[in-house]
Interface confidence: low
Amino acid sequence: LPAQVAFTPYAPEPGGTCRLREYYDQTAQMCCSKCPPGQHAKVFCTKTSDTVCDSCEDSTYTQLWNWVPECLSCGSRCSSDQVETQACTREQNRICTCRPGWYCALSKQEGCRLCAQLRKCRPGFGVARPGTETSDVVCKPCAPGTFSNTTSSTDICRPHQICHVVAIPGNASMDAVCTSTSPTRSMAPGAVHLPQPVSTRSQHTQPTPAPSTAPGTSFLLPVGPSPPAEGSTGDIVLPVGLIVGVTALGLLIIGVVNCVIMTQVKKKPLCLQRETKVPHLPADKARGAQGPEQQHLLTTVPSSSSSSLESSASALDRRAPTRNQPQAPGAEKASGAGEARASTGSSDSSPGGHGTQVNVTCIVNVCSSSDHSSQCSSQASSTMGDTDASPSGSPKDEQVPFSKEECAFRSQLETPETLLGSTEEKPLPLGVPDAGMKPS
């Protein structure tokens, strides 16, 4: 360049380049001025005159120093699921980002092209990972001892309250309902547990660690801002066991006495013998055994089976598909066995309760007067449906009832045929909604 400052337009030296904020005009073969952001070249330079710039019109912009004949058009207005985070000005384009409760499913260089609503985890499922600006919420089934009764993109699984006396056992989508005395929140031993109080969030992507009640497994479980509760259902298991035992013994005696009386009157009894058991569940069956679908035959002891599930919870949790199922935006994941498990839930209000497990077999002999030869039908009725045991995640085809509602004492006018006919098993559905196949 010449020693003195060259004013545009000027001819560059051979092999030289134009200065900053200048461009080389091929037609004029001169170095000419660029136009600043917010302007465009209205008239290009000549050998004798420099570039004439003009302001961009409404809804157009230039963001850089330029020599474009026309300003760029601003992008279209933000859609209803978007928020305009940067307005269209003469110097910058409009930028649209997803509004709260939505995430960017398809981004572009600046802002978002397509927003999708953040997935809402339905009851029985809690948020496992929060949504971000570019990723959706991930839901996970509520582990045993926890529940979520909301459809939310922020709520986590919270622990069941501990009851001194359980009115209704909790499951994955419902808290336990207590009778009278004030409840406390559950706390499993052996793990660093994080509390899960009722969530009242205003932010749309409020992450909260989701619980997993396998002892020693999840360190995000119930303790919390308030001091941990000392209460546990474990301390009422023994009395419940006694009640169950006494009741069973009473029924047995009545049945035996009844049969003895019938025998004494030289009438051959027709005995309908049935067994109802308060099951001592193997570890891999425990989870399916609980929930609102459970038909409690011994209604006087609603909490009789709610305890000693700690080990089974941990064993079963190993199969819980918490967060790896692919999910379409806005759709719930079909998690098969995992979801079935969450839906049947757990009525274990106290994962830490170490009570006495009671295994009661109640044999009820219902005898009716009949001249026909003695007939007895024996039926075990408390087989457990295990929705969680198949490793493939496929729900079992057969639907095994949790238990039968027994109509034990029947009119003596009933014939043997009608009596026997009434023993036909009618499988009750497991009450597991949407138990689709788990994606492999």
Epitope: P100, V127, A128, R129, P130, T132, E133, T134, S135, I156, V192, L194, Q203, H204, T205, Q206, P207, T208, P209, A210, S212, A214, G216, T217, S218, F219, L220, P225, D317, R318, R319, A320, P321, T322, R323, N324, P326
Partner: antibody, heavy 117, light 112 residues
């Protein structure tokens, strides 16, 4: 007992490679997102990378993108961090951490990676 | 430079109440929860507070967390000598692909 145990750290020259491993025990490894978090000597914690439960999604700190690769083998309950083109600024204690909804509730004891000529 | 800002140091005498702040923006703390970690000298970090204000079991109730807007704070009441450690806040950042961000850490010294 829930435990994470890192290994594979050591002294390496700039431009060299190392592979860190993290053996998990006491919990269902395949149910959790896992992360690597590092801490340079006398400095604070810095998240490096994380991976989802089945390994299909991986995220990285910008400064390690293209050089580090996080992976997992659920059958072996092991998390890995393959570190290539190492730089002096990668010198740190590398912790393997279990992520439960964004909170790192279980941490390994850490393994020291020193990048020096 | 950390995404979340913490004071480099804080101090207090035994029995005192100390507060450590953590400042962020609308893309992280403003729209996500905050977790706090305690790192005792020579050990791995330990989760202290999660989801803004919840304590894992085993963490004394002397530790409490809170969040307001784009900042969060950790309060330690009834300070003890064993509380001397580094404290880190952590959150998500909706604008970052990896989304996990830490504060620079605060060294807490218990005097006397």
């Amino acid at each position: 007992e829930v435990q994470l145990l890192e290994s594979g750290g050591g002294l390496v020259q700039p431009g060299g490679s190392l592979r860190l491993s993290c053996a998990a025990s006491g919990f269902t490894f395949s149910d959790y997102y896992m992360s690597w978090v590092r801490q340079a000597p006398g400095k604070g914690l810095e998240w490096v990378a994380n991976i989802n439960t089945d390994g299909s999604e991986k995220y990285y700190l910008d400064s390690v993108k293209g050089r580090f690769t996080i992976s997992r083998d659920n059958s072996k309950n092991t998390l890995y961090l393959q570190m290539n083109s190492l730089r002096a600024e990668d010198t740190a204690v590398y912790y393997c951490a279990r992520e439960e909804y964004g909170a790192f509730d279980i941490w390994g004891q850490g393994t020291l990676v020193t990048v020096s000529s | 430079q950390s995404v979340l800002t913490q004071p480099p140091s804080a101090s207090g005498t035994p029995g005192q109440r100390v507060t450590i702040s953590c400042s962020g923006s609308s893309s992280n703390i403003g729209s996500n929860t905050v977790n706090w970690y305690q790192q005792l000298p020579g050990t791995a970090p330990k989760l202290l507070i999660y989801d803004n204000n919840k304590r894992p079991s085993g963490v004394p109730d002397r530790f409490s967390g809170s969040k307001s807007g784009t900042s969060a704070s950790l309060a330690i009441s009834g300070l003890r000598s064993e509380d001397e450690a580094d404290y880190y806040c952590q959150s998500f950042d909706r604008g970052l692909s990896g989304s996990i961000v830490f504060g620079g850490g605060t060294k807490l010294t218990v005097l006397g």
